[in-house]
Structures are given as C-alpha cells and as structure tokens.
C-alpha cells in the first residue's frame, strides 16, 4: 500500500534497497530553489538545511496576509517528495533550500539567477559530492536564465526543472527550454498527461521525460506531521531529482549525459496517450515515464542513444534547422522530417568544434526539423565522410574507409529544388555492406565511428501498399543509431527515431498513387557495444 | 532547445553621438535588448546586463560604474542591485527604460534582458 507514485517510479527490486555511496554515507546534496519551507516537518527534519538565501519579489495586493504555513506549502511538499523519510523518492538525502519564490509562489528571473550563483559560490567555497539542483518553477523564455543553467551544468551540477503547467510547448519557458537541464513533464496514476484545471503539463521537444505529478502525497507545511497531495510539473521534477540523487548516491561519478541517457533508456515506454497533445507536438514529445534505473554494474556497457529534435526551421526557402547533442555525446546520425514533405535533406557539419545535425527546407515547404541521434560511445573516434552530388543518372557511394570504423548513420542532401527530378537515396546492406548510396543530385554523408567493440548492421523493412509510415526496430541488445527512409514514391516526409524504432513517414498523397512495385523502406542502422570485441560491420 | 523561444529581441542601435562623448562615439551598439513575450510577466525598470563571456571581474565593475556615471550626467539615478561574477559576467540594475540605448552601447555588453516573473509549478 505504498503511494502510487513511488510504486510507479521505483521498481519492486529497488523498494527496500537503500542507496548509499561506496563509503557508506549518502553524499549527494540537492538544492531546492522554491518557497520557504518548514524544516521541522517529520519528513525532512534533520535532512534539510534552510540557507539564509532569500531573493523574492514583494507579494501582490495590499491586503495580502503572510501565513507561514501557506508560504511554506510548495517548497515543503517538494522537499518531502525528494527526500522525505516515508513518502520521498531519495529518502534521507540531504537538501538545501533557497527561497526564490514568495508566499504567492512568484519569483523573478534575477532572483533565480542570484540563487544559482549562490550555489556556484557554495560549490567553490566548499567543494562536496555530487550536486543536484531542483528548479520547480517556470517563466517565459529567458536567454540569460538558460545560459546560467548551462554554465552551472558545465561545472558538473545536475539541474532538473519543471516543464511548466501551461499546456503549451515547454520550449517557450525557462528554465525548461535549457538543453543542459533535465526537463520533466507530469503524468497521473494512469500514466496520462496531467490536466490542471483548463491547463496541464507542458510538452514538446524540450521535455526529456515525464514523471508522476498528479495527486502526489508529500509533507504538508500545515503541521509537522501532516501530509497532503499536490499536483504539477514541480512534483514530477522532484521525482526525477530524487531518482538522480539515488543514482548519484550509488555511482557518484555519473555525468549529466550518462544520467540523462540512463533515465531515458530505463523509463517506461509508450504508455502515454499522445492524443492529449496537439497534433504537431505528438512526434516531438517523448513517450517516457521515469523509473529508477539499475546501476551500471548491473547493466554493463550498453550503447545508449537518444533522439534530439531541433526547433522548427520556419517556412522560408533557405531555412535550416539545427539539432545538437550534449558535449559528451557523439552524433551518430542525422535525419530530417517535414510535415509537407518539402525538404532538401540533412547533413552533418562541424560548428565550433562540435558536429551538428542540419536540415534544409525546400521551396514551398512549411519548414523542417533536424533529428539528431545522440549516443554515449566510450572512447569513440567518429568522423563524417561526404561525397558531393553525382552527375545525372549516377549513384554516389560513401563508405567508412578507415580501418575498424563502422557506419552508424547516413544523411542525404539534395542540391536541386525540384523535388520531382531527383531519385531518392538508399542504403544498401547486401551488395555494398556499410555504404550510404545516394542518387541523382544528392550529396551523401556517412557517419563513421571507431570504438572498442562497436559493431553495427543495417536492418530494413519495406511496405508496398498504402501506409502512412513504415517502421523497423532493432532487436534486443542492439541500439538504433541511424534511421532513413528509402522511398519508392516521390514524396516522403522523412525519418526519425523513437527509442529503438526507426520511423519512415510517407505523404498521404504519395501513398495514394503508389504502385505495388515501389516499396517504401525504413532503414535502420543498429549497433551494439561489446567491449571485448573488435569494431565490425555485421552483414 | 537552444534557439530562442517566443521571445522579444529588439535592436536598439541609437545614434552613438548622442552623448557627445568621444569613447561613446567609437562604440556603436551591437548588443540586443530582450524581454519576455508575455507582457504581464515583465518587470520593466529592472534589467540584467549580460557581458561578453571573457569579461574580467574588474571590467564588470567598471562597466556598471560607467553606466551609473553616464546616467548621472543625464540626470538619472540608477541602482546596481547585484553584480554577477561566478556564473556569467553581468549585473542587475534598476533604472529607467530611457537608459537602455545608452546601456547597450557600453563596451563588453552582449545583451540586456528585462527582468520577468517566474512561478511555482
């Protein structure tokens, strides 16, 4: 009879397990930037340090009455969700509270920045174990708040933020839109998106994953032994902050990139009903509900990948979209997607020493997305091989010519605007193993990687009949690194990865007039990491 | 995730000679002014002045002081509420929006963001 939210995120084998760092003491520290909190509550007493930090705006209204228990309500509840002895995720984790929200739950960007700087100063004055910062707040998009989060993340701090409760695109809010932050949406006991009055959880490509955020039981500031239920993306973010604290408690050296990849990899997949989200956001929103992952010792050297979507390019003729991986991750492939199907393809290029995934809109197109496949490949050495477009009627072949390099992804970019002229690109797994093959007017880009024990293979699935999409999945033990559409018809919307599934999308009109001989093929590159083996291409 | 969201960015490159000061004349504003797209969430009168990433500690203080001095010449009192050293170089200032053009032309300024509200979620 444990609360539903704890049952959901903590698998049975973890329930009784206490997470401790190797020396036996939990040295992870969570910083909570929120309202004031009631430190004497039985759930958090002795675990919480209430710092003297206070940077809040005045409350609105002349008749506003400051009632301590109301002022403390939001923060106390979240502190309880993170580290409460009996209803918390990371029971007993030490927590520091900074007051950046007033009694009405309002704060400022400047106050939040000063709070983040306070944490950085504390870190410099007294370096400690791993730090997790919980930001259960949201404002409009702020370049400086996102930049501050980026700077703090680069010092090794893990930031977890609420996606926002505006039933809107999380990318329009900060700190939710900061790429270096783990951004969390909210789901209910039925694993469905949380509705809050007329609004609800935010969604979109800036959300990393969802977590329980409806009717969450936690410490109530009304009394030192009281509990209450609260709902929101703050509660969801608090669950993930607790999970991260537990992960770091077991393995203090895990990096932000590793934590995010493991959270995504071990989350519960495909339980959220995506119809709740606006149609244009469904493909961008992750269908993931957080669970506490096992330790890396239990799961070995799995190849972990995630899909990163760019912002929409906009409809102008030369509009480009750019998707970036985190600094520690390898960009193993790049694809593109356009709802109108009018796109000029995708490619990988280096910007400021980092490989980025780019996609180009076509004339008359409504815009494109670039879709990056970002992976953790220990000791990887990756490079891009590209070949300019071939003359009319000729194929372009690109393969990985360096010794022990394997093909992890292909990209194709057409020089011509006229979509009817070009033949489509292809991947060939039989006649030319490990090659990207492009056709007329296509520049071809091959992502080639060398890493100990990395092996890859191509898996294709074609459908001749009418179908809006064709999918192909990598089997257990293999990870999807590349995803392309090899169309039979003239117009495809593009391809993208959803977890270990490669999805090739076809335009409605294209499928209507297709002949049975023109199969649309989804081509996946599936890789795995076997540290003892040599890098190899599997036929 | 790194592109600007639904966000207002205004270029305020006003005539650089307006002060009649030699060092100002040499510096045309390339910095931008940003503010929250949701008007109700804005806090006009409080601004975060963000300086270029490599700006040194002393230069941050000098820039804030320079803004105060130039504002005073025009009869404005501005209040530097906080100086940011550790996460990014910059400072928080309470001032009239009339002074934004002047502030954007200061050396080392990358952009200025109007303060805005954040809310418990």
């Amino acid at each position: 009879s444990i609360p539903w939210n704890l049952e959901r995120i903590i698998p049975a084998w973890h329930q009784t397990e206490e997470d401790r760092s190797p020396d036996g003491s939990s040295q992870v520290e969570v910083y909570l930037l929120d309202t004031s909190i009631q430190g004497a509550h039985r759930e958090i007493e002795g675990r919480v340090t209430i710092t003297d930090f206070n940077s809040v705006p005045e409350e609105d209204g002349t008749r506003f009455h400051r009632q301590a228990s109301k002022c403390d309500s939001h923060g106390t509840h979240l502190a309880g969700v993170v580290s409460g002895r009996d209803a918390g995720v990371a029971k007993g984790t030490s927590l520091h509270s900074l007051r950046v929200l007033n009694c009405q739950g309002k704060g400022t960007v400047s106050g939040t920045l000063i709070g983040l700087e306070f944490i950085r100063k504390s870190q410099l004055i007294q370096p400690s174990g791993p730090l997790v910062v919980l930001l259960p707040l949201a404002g409009g998009y702020s370049r400086i708040l996102n930049a501050a989060c980026r700077h703090l993340a680069r010092t090794g701090v893990v930031l977890v933020a609420a996606a926002g409760n505006f039933r809107d695109d999380a990318c329009l809010y900060s700190p939710a839109s900061a790429p270096e932050v783990i951004t969390v949406g909210a789901t209910n006991a039925q694993d469905q998106p949380v509705t809050l009055g007329t609004l609800g959880t935010n969604f979109g490509r800036c959300v990393d994953l969802f977590a329980p955020g409806k009717d969450i039981i936690g410490a109530s500031s009304d009394c030192s032994t009281c509990f209450m239920s609260q709902s929101g993306t703050s509660q969801a973010a608090a669950h993930v902050a607790g999970i991260v604290a537990r992960m770091l408690s077991r393995e203090p050296t895990l990096t932000l990139a590793e934590l995010r990849q493991r959270l995504i990899h071990f989350s519960t997949k495909d339980v959220i009903n995506m119809a709740w989200f606006p149609e244009d956001q469904q493909v961008l929103t992750p269908n993931l509900v957080a669970t506490l992952p096992p330790s890396t010792h239990e799961t070995g050297g799995q190849l972990l990948c995630r899909t990163v979507w760019s912002a929409h390019s906009g409809p102008t003729r030369t509009a480009t979209a750019t998707a970036r991986c985190a600094p520690e991750e390898e960009l193993l492939s790049c694809s593109s997607f356009s709802r109108s199907g009018r796109r000029r393809g995708d490619w990988i290029e280096a910007i400021g020493g980092q490989q980025v995934c780019k996609a180009l809109n076509a004339f008359g197109g409504e815009g494109v997305y670039a879709v990056a496949r970002c992976c953790l490949v220990p000791r990887a050495n990756c490079s891009i091989h590209n070949t300019p477009a071939a003359r009319a009627g000729l194929e372009t072949h690109v393969h990985c010519h360096q010794k022990d390099h394997v093909l992890t992804g292909c990209s194709f970019h057409w020089e011509v605007e006229d979509l009817s002229v070009r033949r489509q690109p292809a991947l060939r797994s039989r006649r030319q193993p490990g090659q990207c093959v492009g056709h007329q007017a296509a520049s071809v880009y091959a992502s080639c990687c060398h890493a100990p024990g990395l092996e890859c293979k191509i898996k294709e699935h074609g459908i001749s009949g009418p179908s809006e999409q064709v999918t192909v999945a990598c089997e257990a033990g293999w990870t999807l690194t590349g995803c392309n559409v090899l169309p039979g018809a003239s117009l495809t919307l593009g391809a993208y990865s959803v977890d270990n599934l490669c999805v090739a999308r076809v335009h409605d009109t294209a499928r209507a007039d297709r002949t049975s001989g023109e199969a649309t093929v989804a081509a996946a590159i599936c890789c795995r990491s076997r540290p003892s083996a040599k890098a190899s291409w599997v036929q | 995730q790194d592109e600007d969201g639904d966000y207002e960015e205004l270029m305020l490159a006003l005539p650089s000679q307006e002060d009649g000061l030699a060092d100002e004349a040499a510096h045309v504003a390339t910095a931008t002014f940003r503010r929250c797209s949701k008007e109700a969430w804005r806090l006009p009168g409080t601004y975060i002045v963000v300086l270029m990433e490599e700006t040194q500690r002393l230069q941050i203080e000098q820039t804030a002081h320079r803004l105060q001095t130039r504002a005073a010449r025009r009869g404005y009192v501005i209040k530097v509420l906080h100086i940011f050293y550790d996460l990014f170089p910059g400072f928080l200032v309470k001032m009239s929006s009339d002074l934004l053009g002047l502030a954007l032309k200061l050396p080392h300024v990358e952009y200025i963001e109007e303060d805005s509200f954040v809310f418990a979620q």
């Epitope: 609360p3 002895r85 009996d86 209803a87 039981i217 009304d222 009394c223 009281c226 239920s229 | -």
Partner: antibody, heavy 126, light 106 residues
Framework: QLQLQESGPGLVKPSETLSLTCTVS??????????WGWIRQPPGKGLEWIGS???????YYNPFLKSRVTISVDTSKNQFSLKLSSVTAADTAVYYC??????????????????WGQGTLVTVSS | EIVLTQSPATLSLSPGERATLSCRAS??????LAWYQQKPGQAPRLLIY???NRATGIPARFSGSGSGTDFTLTISSLEPEDFAVYYC????????FGGGTKVEIK
C-alpha cells in the same frame, strides 16, 4: 480487529535501560498507512508522547527524550520496541503502545493515536 | 514546545447535564487538535480529531469546536459511562497532550 500488547519487565533499576516490546495482532505492521508509537503516563499525571516508528525503520522522537530513546521495528515478528536509557524515578509510568495514522496513504486518515495497547506499568526503583 | 492547558481540572456534573471542557494552546495549532477519553485502568480512546470530527463509533452527544488557540469539547447530555478523564492533544508541532479534565459525578 487490530490489537496491541505491551510486554517487558515491570521493574528497572535507576541508570539502567528500560526495554519494552509491542506485539501487533490482527493487522500488519508493514503497512505504509501507519506509524507505531509509544506514549507514557506517570501515575496520576497526563500523557507524554515518547516517539514513533514507520515500518521502514524511520523514527521520530520527542525532542526532550531524544538523547535517551531508541525505537526499532521487527516486521518479521510484527513487533516494535522501545529502549529508554539512563532511567530515573521520573521515568516511572504506564507505557502505552499505539497505532498512529500516517497520512502517507490518504485513506488512513490524519495522524491521531488509536487503537492503544492496555498499557504496562514500569517502576524505576533500586 | 506547544503547551496545552485544560480547564477546569475537575468538572462535577450530574447525568443528563451538559459538559463543556476547554483546551487552550500556547500558540496556534490551527485545527490540529484531538480529544481523548480515559477511564481508570484503561488506555485512552480517540473521541474527536481535527477539532470537530467525531472518530468512528463515537456517539453524537460528543462534539468539538474551535480553532487556533481555543478549543471546546461538549458533551450535550452526560451518560453514566461518560464520567472519565478527558485529554486534548495537538499535532501542529509534533505531539503534546493537555493535563486533563476529570468529569466526575456530582
């Protein structure tokens, strides 16, 4: 229905440790719906809360007794225990064990005490 | 520590009469106050919780009121079995009990 029964020595010497056990029957001590508490009542006086424990082992003590109190739980035996060290005559009392609703599970209701054991008198005397 | 003061210490009434017991807190306990009944040689029994809610199986003649610092337990018409000691208890800040009010037969 749920019953609680205190057991332990009725006489303890000053400066020694008082040890009592409460056995729960008719229900599981491992429910997240409840805490399990100790309350005492010196002869002819009022009630004083000593402390409580959750099935997971997390403990909560009266700040005035904290330094001398240890409460533990044995879920396999459906029991929880009290140890009070360095006792004096002032610790002579009837000691009750009681269930306390936790509030962690809303259906359990707010955290008040009930049912109670019938109590056991412990006298501190040499 | 929140101190609860009960008055009167003793209340002498006859069966059928109305009993009014008072409990005052040294600081606000909101509505986080309960009333218990204890008979000689028995453990206390919960009567009222959160100031005014009757516990399961408690007769309607028992009622509680108040919030903040002043609370009242009322027994509308005393029955012979109601003669006992009554304690108030707060949970606003951990748990403390009042000194008790003895309701005795006049």
């Amino acid at each position: 229905q749920l019953q609680l029964q205190e057991s332990g020595p009725g006489l303890v010497k000053p400066s020694e440790t008082l040890s009592l056990t409460c056995t729960v029957s008719g229900g599981s001590i491992s429910s997240s719906s409840y805490y399990w508490g100790w309350i005492r009542q010196p002869p002819g006086k009022g009630l004083e809360w000593i402390g409580s424990i959750y099935y997971s082992g997390s403990t909560y003590y009266n700040p005035f007794l904290k330094s001398r109190v240890t409460i533990s739980v044995d879920t396999s035996k459906n029991q929880f225990s009290l140890k009070l060290s360095s006792v004096t005559a002032a610790d002579t009392a009837v000691y009750y064990c009681a269930r306390e609703n936790s509030g962690v599970v809303p259906a359990a209701g707010p955290n008040w005490f009930g049912p109670w054991g019938q109590g056991t008198l412990v006298t501190v005397s040499s | 520590e929140i101190v609860l003061t009960q008055s009167p210490a003793t209340l002498s009434l006859s069966p059928g009469e109305r009993a009014t017991l008072s409990c005052r807190a040294s600081q606000s306990v909101s509505s986080y106050l309960a009333w218990y009944q204890q008979k000689p040689g028995q453990a206390p029994r919960l009567l009222i919780y959160d100031a005014s809610n009757r516990a399961t199986g408690i007769p309607a003649r028992f009622s509680g009121s108040g919030s903040g610092t002043d609370f009242t337990l009322t027994i509308s018409s005393l029955e012979p079995e109601d003669f006992a000691v009554y304690y108030c208890q707060q949970r606003r800040n951990w748990f403390t009990f009042g000194g008790g009010t003895k309701v005795e037969i006049k």
